[in-house]
């Protein structure tokens, strides 16, 4: 039971994460113009890794799309990479991971071959959840450098006459949102690599059992001790005490043998 | 259509204060920010403040102390007040919408303001 | 806070003239954000309320005719009538729509010979 709850817990958190890392990805306020310290302008600009805006005091709001590849930033190319990479091996790691659960039942799918799948997708929500954190802290890195570079020459002068606003950014709420998304999807990785042990079907699972002979007509086998504690893999005697040594998750998944789908 | 009126009490005593009310009409208040621009006679504009459509105001640095403005959005009035009034703040005042570009694409009638004992 | 100036205060023209007026602000209009220049020029006549010409240095409003045009970047900026009209007798004020206070200029007053 803890296991499934693991893996259902882990799959709903990697799932919230991988839907705030879209919804990042997606956002215009990856950066927001710096109103501390700056002269009060009537216009609000932001930036995201698609587009900028500039929303207007009257309400009017316009953005832009950045329509060149090859005029951008290396830094925005490689956190655009990042969060793209980040989506889409979070989008199969979701795929591998419904066929994996515990409580979805697809034809005579083997525990071994779930504790795979539930490894596989902890791994890639794992790799996804870094690739957004990395992306996100790559791009905030560029903010502050920008940010202290621009506090540096706040007005540029022309021949100290003429005064033009320098306009800095800092921190957009997209940043705060890939941030926690990224670390959910971390997380419901981790959760998931955890589960994993839990469904693979190891002579190391089974728990100490207590054996009660009922009378002298119990014979024991030569391989028997050796299956019930665990040592050596001789996996023909894996399963001699069936009727006493089964641990929990074996006993609820025990009737899906037969079920129908 | 678009209309902005502007209504006052035409004459006020110095050191007094004052109210000037702009009633708008063929669009809301919680859509569009609305500004007060004031002309003393033969001369020039004079830009006074604002409020934006979500009720955020900015006000004329040298005025701002005795300025303030407010807005009944069920009624659809903008509301400027000013306080210690003096003679040279006799003008003719303006209510206008801002558009795009925070430019005023619709200007109210007027109405005059005369400071004088 | 800013300032803005305009020149010249006044200017006589014939019907039919071309005719330039300037803007010049104390601090620079263009936001970088979205590449536009936060200046209006407005068209005042007497008796009458102002009325909007062009916005964003160089957008005419609708229903302005085409011989209005505006142009210029940062701190310079100039409104150009290509022939003048009897109609266009007014005084032309440019105003600051960037920085807080949304200051005026003085007004440039065009009169016919």
């Known amino acids: 039971m803890a296991v499934t709850a693991c893996q259902g817990l882990g799959f709903v958190v990697s799932l919230i994460g991988i839907a705030g890392i879209i919804a990042a990805t997606c956002m215009d306020q990856w950066s927001t113009q710096d109103l501390y310290n700056n002269p009060v302008t009537a216009v609000f600009n932001y930036q995201g890794l698609w587009r900028s805006c500039v929303r207007e005091s009257s309400g009017f709001t316009e953005c832009r799309g950045y329509f060149t590849l090859l005029g951008l930033p290396a830094m925005l190319q490689a956190v655009r990479a990042l969060m793209i990479v980040g989506i889409v091996l979070g989008a199969i790691g979701l795929l591998v991971s419904i066929f994996a659960l515990k409580c979805i039942r697809i034809g005579s799918m083997e525990d071994s071959a779930k504790a795979n799948m539930t490894l596989t997708s902890g791994i890639m929500f794992i790799v996804s959840g870094l690739c957004a954190i990395a992306g996100v802290s790559v791009f905030a890195n560029m903010l502050v450098t920008n940010f202290w570079m621009s506090t540096a020459n706040m007005y540029t002068g022309m021949g100290g006459m003429v005064q033009t606003v320098q306009t800095r950014y800092t921190f957009g709420a997209a940043l705060f949102v890939g941030w926690v998304a990224g670390g959910l999807t971390l997380i419901g990785g981790v959760m998931m690599c955890i589960a994993c042990r839990g469904l693979a079907p190891e002579e190391t699972n089974y728990k100490a059992v207590s054996y009660h002979a009922s009378g002298h007509s119990v014979a024991y086998k030569p391989g028997g001790f050796k299956a019930s504690t665990g040592f050596g893999s001789n996996t023909k005697n894996k399963k001699i005490y069936d009727g006493g040594a089964r641990t929990e998750d074996e006993v609820q998944s025990y009737p899906s043998k037969h079920d129908y789908v | 259509q678009v209309q902005l009126k502007e209504s006052g009490p035409g004459l006020v005593a110095p050191s007094q204060s004052l109210s000037i009310t702009c009633t708008v009409s063929?669009?809301?208040?919680?859509?569009?920010?609305v500004h007060w621009v004031r002309q003393p006679p033969g001369k020039g504009l004079e830009w006074l403040g604002v409020?934006?459509?979500?009720?955020?105001?900015n006000y004329d640095s040298t005025l701002m102390s005795r300025l303030s403005i407010s807005k009944d959005r069920s009624k659809s009035q903008v509301f400027l007040k000013m306080t210690s009034l003096q003679t040279d703040d006799t003008a003719m005042y303006y209510c206008?919408?801002?558009?795009?570009?925070?430019?005023?694409?619709?200007w109210g009638q007027g109405t005059t303001l005369t400071v004088s004992s | 806070d800013i300032v803005m100036t305009q020149s010249p205060s006044s200017l006589t023209v014939t019907a039919g003239e071309k005719v330039t007026m300037r803007c010049r602000s104390s601090?620079?209009?263009?936001?970088?954000?979205?590449?536009?220049?936060?200046l209006t020029w407005y068209q005042q006549k007497p008796g009458q309320p102002p009325k909007l010409l062009i916005y964003?240095?160089?957008t005419r409003e609708s229903g302005v005719p085409d011989r209005f045009t505006g142009s210029g970047s940062g701190t310079d900026f100039t409104l150009t009538i290509s022939s003048v009209q009897a109609e266009d007798l007014a005084v032309y004020y440019c105003?600051?729509?960037?920085?807080?206070?949304?200051?005026f200029g003085a007004g440039t007053k065009l009169e016919l010979k």
């Open positions: 206008a919408r801002s558009l795009y570009g925070n430019s005023f694409d619709h």
């Open positions: 063929g669009f809301s208040l919680t859509s569009y920010g």
């Open positions: 409020i934006w459509a979500g009720g955020s105001t």
């Open positions: 601090q620079s209009l263009f936001n970088s954000g979205n590449q536009r220049n936060y």
């Open positions: 964003w240095a160089s």
């Open positions: 105003q600051n729509n960037y920085i807080y206070p949304l200051a």
